[in-house]
């Protein structure tokens, strides 16, 4: 349905508050280095313009596309060339090339200062003094650091952020009330950002078909009672929503997401029995709730898959008539029966099935050729099952910190060229799979673990893409989206790696480590561990453990000393010497 003025249409659909918030997010995700005040000014100008279009859709420029309007506005920024360099060249292009150019310059790891949380009283004062600016600043700071954050979901986070301050700034113990809530929002926000980053990577690097396959599998697991036609409709709509958000079309994305939530709730009887509570909530909570809703129970008496996909004489006929529809039905039928499988495993099975049909439907006796196709699934299913079993046993034996360290060593040996901060960040996140998933019963472990690992490995892929240093990482990241995890799992020690030169400065520590939080202290130690492995890739587990134990004892000793700095200087030299001797450096 065409509208005379797209900007007026979206302003009316979304309302002024959401419109302004979404434009701010869009601008902050594109121009990640611009000061807050500059963005607010641009947003206000766009909002005033939108209001004129609401009043008169035929007014000048109101018929322009949102990309044209927003791009023109971004290109008015005076310091574009100085701040962003070649990104300024985007402004010489016409739409849609200009928007594509802006998208290509989004930076997953922008050079921005770490967000430091002020004292609670300072935050509460700022909140009370100017609530609107305080919340806008939250949107701005998150959006610029997470340029692919799912915008309508960020509105939901902002709503919870506001609620936390509204409640806790009146509490007797403000800090006790507020800090856990902020920690929870931070952790959930990081997870949400990483999950959305995978969706965008899937769309942008592997195309709409890959995303749709993922969506068919996930929605079929979640809504196993919904019919294939219903799931297909939801997949089409969901793909549109995510394509828009990943493409920077945040107003359209938020509007379409609201429409999709409305449709799901109006048709919940045909979709899932688990949606009732979600559908009673206000819009932002409703959409979030639907996205996180638990899997519905499987319909009773689902027949054998073999009947339609192996035993039927019409398999090749049905496949030839509409390949993607038939494969989609296979994926739907398999996924709804297997909430215990990861989405990526289901996609591997579908790929195997597709490959088999491609080969067999051209053979002399197709049925004889594909009769045993389900037997080929067995090793594909057992591989992640065994891997998860082994790693959960290791996690239960070591605990999270030491499990992370084991992964740090494992991954540094696989891809030692990757930067130390990236290896630390990714391995720490990989290690969190233990506490996140190993507590689950068997039936929930694989979807939890392998789909989470897909999200974390995508972080490695997008960070590595910015500055490629390892052919092995590039290969695992680009060859197959669903085989990324098995590809990384299969990597052995990189024998071609030339060990890093020893630099004593890397292993020099100061008294400031004593005032760090437990988490930050762990990161310092884990950074040292990665550097050790880069210097001595052939070091054994036992050698590394001994050095790390000595290092932990050294930090503990010096943090208890009266003259901490002297202790770190003197004992540090001894530790470096002892470590060099122990590792044969």
């Amino acid at each position: 349905d065409a509208h005379k003025s797209e900007v007026a249409h979206r302003f009316k659909d979304l309302g002024e508050e959401n419109f302004k918030a979404l434009v701010l997010i869009a601008f902050a995700q594109y121009l990640q280095q611009c000061p807050f005040e500059d963005h607010v000014k641009l947003v206000n100008e766009v909002t005033e313009f939108a209001k004129t279009c609401v009043a008169d859709e035929s007014a000048e420029n109101c018929d322009k596309s949102l990309h044209t309007l927003f791009g023109d506005k971004l290109c008015t920024v005076a310091t574009l060339r100085e701040t962003y360099g070649e990104m300024a060249d985007c402004c010489a292009k016409q739409e849609p090339e200009r928007n594509e150019c802006f998208l290509q310059h989004k930076d997953d790891n922008p050079n921005l200062p770490r967000l430091v949380r002020p004292e609670v009283d300072v935050m509460c004062t700022a909140f009370h003094d100017n609530e609107e600016t305080f919340l806008k600043k939250y949107l701005y700071e998150i959006a610029r650091r997470h340029p692919y954050f799912y915008a309508p979901e960020l509105l939901f986070f902002a709503k919870r952020y506001k609620a936390a301050f509204t409640e806790c700034c009146q509490a007797a113990d403000k800090a006790a009330c507020l800090l856990p809530k902020l920690d929870e929002l931070r952790d959930e926000g990081k997870a949400s950002s990483a999950k959305q980053r995978l969706k965008c990577a899937s769309l942008q690097k592997f195309g709409e078909r890959a995303f749709k396959a993922w969506a068919v599998a996930r929605l079929s697991q979640r809504f196993p009672k919904a019919e294939f036609a219903e799931v297909s409709k939801l997949v089409t709509d969901l793909t549109k929503v995510h394509t828009e958000c990943c493409h920077g079309d945040l107003l359209e994305c938020a509007d379409d997401r609201a429409d999709l939530a409305k449709y799901i709730c109006e048709n919940q009887d045909s979709i899932s029995s688990k949606l009732k509570e979600c559908c009673e909530k206000p819009l932002l909570e409703k959409s979030h709730c639907i996205a996180e809703v638990e899997n519905d129970e499987m319909p009773a008496d689902l027949p054998s898959l073999a009947a339609d996909f192996v035993e039927s004489k019409d398999v090749c006929k049905n496949y030839a008539e509409a390949k993607d529809v038939f494969l989609g039905m296979f994926l739907y039928e398999y996924a709804r029966r297997h909430p215990d499988y990861s989405v990526v495993l289901l996609l591997r099975l579908a790929k195997t099935y597709e490959t088999t049909l491609e080969k067999c439907c051209a053979a002399a006796d197709p049925h004889e050729c594909y009769a045993k196709v389900f037997d080929e699934f067995k090793p594909l299913v057992e591989e992640p099952q065994n891997l998860i079993k082994q790693n959960c046993e290791l996690f239960e034996q070591l605990g999270e910190y030491k499990f992370q360290n084991a992964l740090l060593v494992r991954y540094t040996k696989k891809v030692p060229q990757v930067s130390t901060p990236t290896l630390v960040e990714v391995s720490r996140n990989l290690g969190k799979v233990g506490s996140k998933c190993c507590k689950h019963p068997e039936a929930k472990r694989m979807p939890c673990a392998e789909d989470y690992l897909s999200v974390v490995l995508n972080q490695l892929c997008v960070l590595h893409e910015k500055t490629p240093v390892s052919d092995r990482v590039t290969k695992c990241c680009t060859e197959s989206l669903v085989n990324r995890r098995p590809c990384f799992s299969a990597l052995e020690v990189d024998e071609t790696y030339v060990p890093k030169e020893f630099n004593a400065e890397t292993f020099t520590f100061h008294a400031d480590i004593c005032t760090l939080s437990e988490k930050e202290r762990q990161i310092k130690k884990q950074t040292a561990l990665v550097e050790l492995v880069k210097h001595k890739p052939k070091a054994t587990k036992e050698q590394l453990k001994a050095v790390m134990d000595d290092f932990a004892a050294f930090v503990e000793k010096c943090c208890k000393a009266d003259d901490k700095e002297t202790c770190f200087a003197e004992e540090g030299k001894k530790l470096v010497a002892a470590s060099q001797a122990a590792l044969g450096l």
Epitope: E227, S270, P299, A300, D301, S304, A307, V310, E311
Partner: antibody, heavy 117, light 107 residues
Amino acid sequence: ELQLVESGGGLVQPGGSLRLSCAASGFTSDDFVMHWVRQAPGKGLEWVSAIRWDDGSTYYAESMKGRFTISRDNAKNTLYLQMNSLKSEDTAVYYCAKSVSASSNYWGQGTQVTVSS
Amino acid sequence: DIVMTQSPSSLSVSLGDRVTITCQASQNIISYLAWYQQKPGQTPKLLIYGASRLQTGVPSRFSGSGSGTSFTLTISGVEAEDVATYYCLQHLTYPLTFGQGTKVELK
């Protein structure tokens, strides 16, 4: 061709027990559901119980929970229904069936269970 | 439990008549409905599954329609061999439930 053959029916006193068997042949996979359905004399069909062949999950009609137990032996390709504390209203023909709601649907010929003193 | 209410409970028909049997579910069962035919002294035979899909080997005069809570089995031109009792079955959730049956006989 898949075949289902029930056995184990007969005459039993109220409060007694009976174990029905259903021998299956011709299976090509194990991702399906097997059912017991009964039909009292001159009455309609009544679903009794079901079991998923692959993972052994079981389901029962409310009135039979606690008294009836469905099980299967994969190695023997046999379905069972252990019936305890039998009542006269359990008198019926008991059918075993595979996938009662799909094209891959098969029924046995049924076995008569009579509960009478 | 989901209750399936079939109507009518019986009907007398002439050869060639168009027959309609309805089945009402006490809650939305989407399209998880099957229709069975049972002739005296025989095992039940599946006619329709998925509310409207004709089982292989079943004559095309049988058809099923409906979704949600209201379903229909139609025999477009009754033949003598169609004398039987017809049952609907919901298989959305356990416990599975049958309708009470509709007995079709010739006038």
